[in-house]
């Protein structure tokens, strides 16, 4: 514990001189800034060296005294300039100054590399007052030094807005080499040269580097840090590390794996996410990339029908997001689908093939050759057509939808008829005489209603007209036919 001396007693030795080594044991300081821990540092450096007082940073404070009294110059005593110690050791160093008591207002602080050390935990300031002079020792201790404690430490005393600065004390923390750059894992092309870099620092310097490949040293002679290892090429995976040596010992870097790029493994788990009449959405899990990023993927689609010609459709897509919608497929058809992906080395094998089916769709074309004629005796309109080609039915026909629109003197009326799938004719009752009837027909499957045929018009005369003739779907490009009877 720090005890206080008798405040008016004056037994304390003054600077300059072998201070504080010559202090008698009962000469305890008047004041102190306590150390946070009671740790006794492993190294203690005396604040002074015998000989001349330090004159490098002498300050004669510019104070205009009421009675113009001159103030003597002040300077910190010389102290040890350079402290070298091992990591995790303790250190204590100090600066000292004798301040005449007429300097009634001073502050003392520690700075490291130009920044004030604000924490009080390391600092202890002791005062040894005498009648005319107060000796001040400002000590700084570090219990377990780290590399970050390296630097230049100074004391600053501020008096009347003037600063007195001590000589710097350089702290050099020595330890095992510390890596600033370690080799990085790489993926390389077979038999292609590549470089690895290793850099480590002390202190102490120099730091020498040995390279290790698969537990065997590569270089017989060490290289000074930093070191670049050029590997002419590999045919198989290898693990590299570097050893950094200095006078304190050896540090080994992390081991890094150098992989040889290869073609990817085939994708796995190709699955159907959604099917429509003409498209299938698939997803897949990419296989191992062969240590080289995927560039793109290829979706191969072939008809599963044994009677098909076996041709394969190929769709190319980006490697991400492992999802693709295959379009332009036939409705109600079976397909085999496989996926292959590539990296810079080449294409993977194709994934296991999966079977997928499109659903039933609405027909893609209208019924053909629609003809309409008036059966005046029964007051009906007869309609005939041909079913769409099987391939374009996109499903199993369940019937037809007939739209007939009756127009007369500004009045228009549309009616819809549903007809079963058998046959290709229908009869509808005349709704209005002296009117135009416009007929359109669409094929229907369970997948929906297909497009309507082009309109066919027929004029229904007033009762008593004799002549009539059929009206039919026009040839492409012709105007809508109108038959007047």
């Amino acid at each position: 514990a720090i005890t206080e001396a008798r405040e008016e007693a004056k037994p304390y030795p003054l600077f300059p001189g072998p201070f504080p080594g010559s202090l008698q044991t009962d000469h305890t300081p008047l004041l102190s800034l306590p150390h946070a821990s009671g740790y006794q540092p492993a190294l203690m450096f005396s604040p002074t060296q015998p000989g001349r007082p330090h004159t490098g940073n002498v300050a004669i404070p510019q104070v205009t005294s009421v009675e113009s009294k001159p103030l003597p110059p002040l300077a910190f005593k010389h102290t040890v300039g350079h402290i070298i110690l091992s990591e995790h050791k303790g250190v204590k160093f100090n600066c000292s100054i004798s301040v005449p008591n007429i300097y009634q207002d001073t502050t003392i602080s520690w700075w490291k590399d130009g920044k004030e050390l604000l924490g009080a935990h390391h600092a202890i300031t002791q005062f040894y007052p005498d009648d005319e002079v107060t000796a001040i020792i400002a000590s700084f201790s570090i219990t377990s030094v780290q590399r970050s404690d390296n630097g230049s430490y100074i004391c600053k005393m501020k008096i009347n807005n003037e600063e007195i600065v001590s000589d710097p004390i350089y702290i050099e923390v020595q330890g095992l080499p510390h890596f600033t750059k370690q080799p990085e894992s790489m993926n390389v092309t077979r038999n292609t040269a590549f470089n690895l870099t290793c850099q480590a620092v002390g202190p102490p310097e120099p730091v020498n580097i040995f390279w290790v490949q698969n537990s065997s040293r590569v270089n017989e002679q060490p290289e000074k840090s930093p070191s670049v290892l050029t590997v002419p090429g590999l045919t198989e995976m290898a693990v590299f590390s570097c050893e950094a040596h200095n006078d304190k010992g050896l540090t080994v870097s992390k081991g890094v794996q150098i992989n040889i790029k290869a073609i990817p493994s085939p994708p796995t788990e190709v699955s159907i996410r959604n099917s429509t009449a003409h498209s299938i959405l698939i997803s897949w899990v990419p296989g191992f990339d062969g240590y080289s990023p995927f560039r793109n993927c290829s979706i191969q689609v072939k008809e599963a029908d044994p009677l098909s010609n076996g041709s394969v459709m190929i769709f190319n897509t980006s490697a991400l997001p492992h999802l693709y919608q295959i379009k332009q497929l036939q409705a109600l058809a079976n397909y085999s689908i496989g996926v292959s992906c590539m990296n810079e080395i080449g294409w993977s094998a194709v994934s296991p093939w999966i079977l997928a089916s499109t659903t039933e769709g609405a027909p893609s074309v209208a019924p053909l050759n629609v003809t309409v004629f008036l059966n005046e005796s029964s007051d009906n309109v007869d309609i005939r057509w041909m079913k769409p080609p099987t391939k374009q039915q996109d499903g199993e026909l369940v019937g037809y939808r007939i739209s007939h629109v009756w127009q007369s003197a500004g009045i228009s009326k549309e009616l819809l008829e549903e007809v079963g799938q058998n046959g290709s004719r229908a009869r509808i009752s005349v709704q209005v005489h002296n009117a135009t009837c416009t007929v359109r027909i669409a094929a229907v499957t369970r997948g929906g209603v297909g497009p309507f045929s082009d309109p066919v018009k027929i004029f229904i005369p007033a009762h008593g007209w004799v002549d009539y003739a059929p009206s039919s779907t026009p040839a492409p490009g012709n105007a809508d036919p109108v038959l007047i009877i």
């Epitope: 306590p34 301040v99 008591n101 007429i102 009634q104 009080a120 600092a123």
Partner: antibody, heavy 120, light 107 residues
Framework: QVQLVQSGSELKKPGASVKVSCKAS????????MNWVRQAPGQGLEWMGW????????TYADDFKGRFVFSLDTSVSTAYLQISSLKAEDTAVYYC?????????????WGQGTLVTVSS | DIQMTQSPSSLSASVGDRVTITCRAS??????VAWYQQKPGKAPKRLIY???NRHTGVPSRFSGSGSGTEFTLTISNLQPEDFATYYC?????????FGGGTKLEIK
């Protein structure tokens, strides 16, 4: 031994002036600065400022700039506090307090205090 | 200016008790804190300087601790003569500033 002896109580009218003295003994007067501290009735301590007893240079806290003057007579080891244009709110006990060693600004010895009462 | 916030403002305790008074600085004042005891009608009396050092003649039951912004004065085994008002003072930066005081009363 160190002693700081202050002048006796004062009763003043508003607008008047008062000068409080603080006589030091038992140490070298010019080696320690002198602080002045005010304590209004029932209130806490308030640092007014200090005077460098070697150079005679005063330093005032912001609230005590203007009507308050610190001065010295080193021949008789005495510090003075003068307050002019007294106001009722200047009623307080005024203490002188010796500054501790250089590089530590706390007070190690105090005067017994002087009660200044301002009343019409 | 550096504010010194002292707590509690008053405290009741019995002889033999242990009490702690706290001062919080509004910025880092290192260990530049002193503690004073004042009895009614008397000048303050010095107790602790530089946060943790007892002045000559101050009983060992008074102890101070802290650095930076948090400081405490502890009185163990309270004696009848310890009932008084206690003040902290930061003397790191001008203007010097006191805490508001803690009045220690007999329970």
């Amino acid at each position: 031994q160190v002693q700081l002896v202050q002048s006796g109580s004062e009763l003043k009218k508003p607008g008047a002036s008062v000068k409080v003295s603080c006589k030091a003994s038992g140490y070298t007067f010019t080696n320690h600065g002198m602080n002045w501290v005010r304590q209004a009735p029932g209130q806490g301590l308030e640092w007014m400022g200090w005077i460098n007893t070697y150079t005679g240079e005063p330093t005032y806290a912001d609230d005590f700039k203007g009507r308050f003057v610190f001065s010295l007579d080193t021949s008789v080891s005495t510090a003075y506090l003068q307050i002019s244009s007294l106001k009722a709110e200047d009623t307080a006990v005024y203490y002188c307090a010796r500054k501790g060693v250089t590089a530590a600004r706390y007070f190690d010895y105090w005067g017994q205090g002087t009660l200044v009462t301002v009343s019409s | 200016d550096i504010q010194m916030t002292q707590s509690p403002s008053s405290l009741s305790a019995s002889v033999g008790d242990r009490v702690t008074i706290t001062c919080r600085a509004s910025q880092n004042v290192r260990t530049a804190v002193a503690w004073y005891q004042q009895k009614p009608g008397k000048a303050p009396k010095r107790l602790i300087y530089l946060a943790s050092n007892r002045h000559t003649g101050v009983p060992s039951r008074f102890s101070g601790s802290g650095s930076g912004t948090e400081f405490t004065l502890t009185i163990s085994n309270l004696q009848p003569e310890d009932f008084a008002t206690y003040y902290c003072l930061q003397h790191w930066n001008y203007p010097l500033t006191f805490g508001g005081g803690t009045k220690l009363e007999i329970k």
